[in-house]
Interface confidence: low
């Protein structure tokens, strides 16, 4: 057995996520390092990974989730300090949440869960409230994004995936307008012809008349 020295900190009702970065690489993750979209199993699939003796039971740029996540991960994981004004309050997960056995030299908590700062156990995220898309040791789930007024929800927030928001029809967001949806152009300038309709992530595309023929 290993020896354990645990600091005796007073439990706080507000949880900070400076506990560390979300692990985006292995463990339900592909080769190191990978992007946000990890290839690992679902939280449900990994929920059975309770360690014990043998006797025991044996992406598209128009989706705001991509850009938002980059900032959420950096902001939440590196800047938030427990007890600071920026801390995240974890929603009460005492009812109906599943816990996995934790060991001091254990694995990361699976996607869809987070590390309990008090017990060290993995607590499941609350569906529609928080998520973790990769194995992690965060002290709280990342909060689900609420789509802005100029956006629509492409897919709802699950325990393992953030809300995917996209611009409403007739508007778009590209790399130049990451924070707001812009109205699509109504038509092409004189001498140009439309070859591509507006999408939530790009404006209409126009080409010079002579090269555009036959592309409609």
């Amino acid at each position: 057995a290993s020896g354990t020295e645990a600091a005796t900190a007073t439990p706080s009702k507000v949880w900070g996520s400076s506990a560390g970065r979300i692990e985006l690489r292995g463990g339900g993750r592909g080769a190191l390092p990978t992007s946000m979209g990890q290839q690992g199993p679902s939280a449900q699939a990994r929920a059975g990974r309770v360690v014990g003796p043998r006797s025991a039971q044996g992406a598209s740029p128009g989706l705001r989730v991509h850009k938002t996540l980059k900032f959420v991960v950096v902001g939440v994981l590196l800047q938030v300090v427990p007890g600071s004004a920026a801390t995240i309050k974890v929603h009460d997960q005492s009812v109906g949440t599943q816990q996995w056995e934790h060991s001091p030299l254990g694995e990361l908590c699976p996607p869809g869960s987070h590390r309990s700062e008090h017990s060290g156990a993995c607590n499941q995220c609350t569906e529609g409230v928080g998520y973790t898309s990769a194995s992690n040791n965060l002290f709280s789930c990342l909060p689900c994004t609420a789509c802005k007024s100029d956006e629509e929800e492409r897919s709802a927030c699950t325990r393992t995936r953030n809300t995917a928001c996209q611009c409403k029809p007739g508007t778009f967001r590209n790399d130049d307008s990451a924070e707001m949806c812009r109205k699509c152009s109504t038509g092409c300038p004189r001498g140009k012809v439309k070859v591509k309709d507006c999408t939530p992530w790009s404006d209409i595309e126009c080409v010079h008349n002579e090269s555009g023929n036959g592309h409609n």
Partner: antibody
Framework: EVQLVESGGGLVKPGGSLRLSCAAS????????MHWVRQAPGKGLEWVAG????????YYADSVKGRFTISRDNAKNSLYLQMNSLRAEDTAVYYC??????????????WGQGTLVTVSS | QPVLHQPPAMSSALGTTIRLTCTLR?????????VYWYQQRPGHPPRFLLR?????????GPQVPPRFSGSKDVARNRGYLSISELQPEDEAMYYC???????????FGSGTQLTVLS
């Protein structure tokens, strides 16, 4: 580039003390768990101690419990191993290793070159 | 009896494929463990190679080529490290480790010395 550089090794008499240091660079030290692993001459790897990202949780192998103390100074990007009541069997190359997570796992993704500790009279 | 058992030595010819074994003591179930593999060349520190839990849940170490791959045999309670297209630089000691248990007395296996025959 991730770098871990151990120092503080040397020759010490049985019962003596030594403090090993590990200087970390090339990553955000304060967000990773860290370990000390040793290797006696011609032998295999033996995990010695581990500490989580904040220093709040420390873990030791039975063989060193009560004699060794692991600590870290995140402001200085440094990991330490205070070794007291040293024995001949503590003679080994001591490696500093980074855990891939904030807590402690068996996934030690980067290792230092090691520092040799010799306990002999 | 150690928690993890590795054969002390194995050898194979240049360019061939070899499979190293790490057997978990039978009072534990490898089905719930990840298997970790480390390589240590003479005079060098250990290097993390890979972690294997299942085909869909695995990770490769930094700059570790796909010639190195992991697998498990739950029925035999074993983890494997396969090395294909053996090269001279693969001659090294290979250690396995498994997670996660609260007991950390035996984190690493005893190691297998791999010899590459030319």
């Amino acid at each position: 580039e991730v770098q871990l550089v151990e120092s503080g090794g040397g020759l010490v008499k049985p019962g003596g003390s030594l403090r090993l240091s590990c200087a970390a660079s090339g990553f955000t030290f304060s967000t990773y768990g860290m370990h000390w692993v040793r290797q006696a001459p011609g032998k295999g790897l033996e995990w010695v101690a581990g500490i989580n990202y904040s220093g709040n949780n420390k873990y030791y192998a039975d063989s060193v419990k009560g004699r060794f103390t692991i600590s870290r100074d995140n402001a200085k990007n440094s990991l330490y191993l205070q070794m007291n009541s040293l024995r001949a069997e503590d003679t080994a190359v001591y490696y500093c290793a980074r855990d891939h997570s904030t807590w402690l796992s068996r996934h030690l993704d980067y290792w230092g070159q090691g520092t040799l500790v010799t306990v002999s009279s | 009896q150690p928690v993890l058992h590795q054969p002390p030595a194995m050898s194979s010819a240049l360019g061939t494929t070899i499979r190293l074994t790490c057997t978990l003591r039978n009072d534990h179930d490898i089905g719930v463990y990840s298997v970790y593999w480390y390589q240590q060349r003479p005079g060098h520190p250990p290097r993390f190679l890979l972690r294997y839990f299942s085909q869909s849940d695995k990770s490769q170490g930094p700059q570790v080529p796909p010639r190195f791959s992991g697998s498990k045999d739950v029925a035999r309670n074993r983890g494997y490290l396969s090395i294909s297209e053996l090269q001279p630089e693969d001659e090294a000691m290979y250690y396995c480790a498994m997670g996660a248990r609260s007991s950390v007395t035996h984190v690493f296996g005893s190691g297998t010395q791999l010899t590459v025959l030319s």
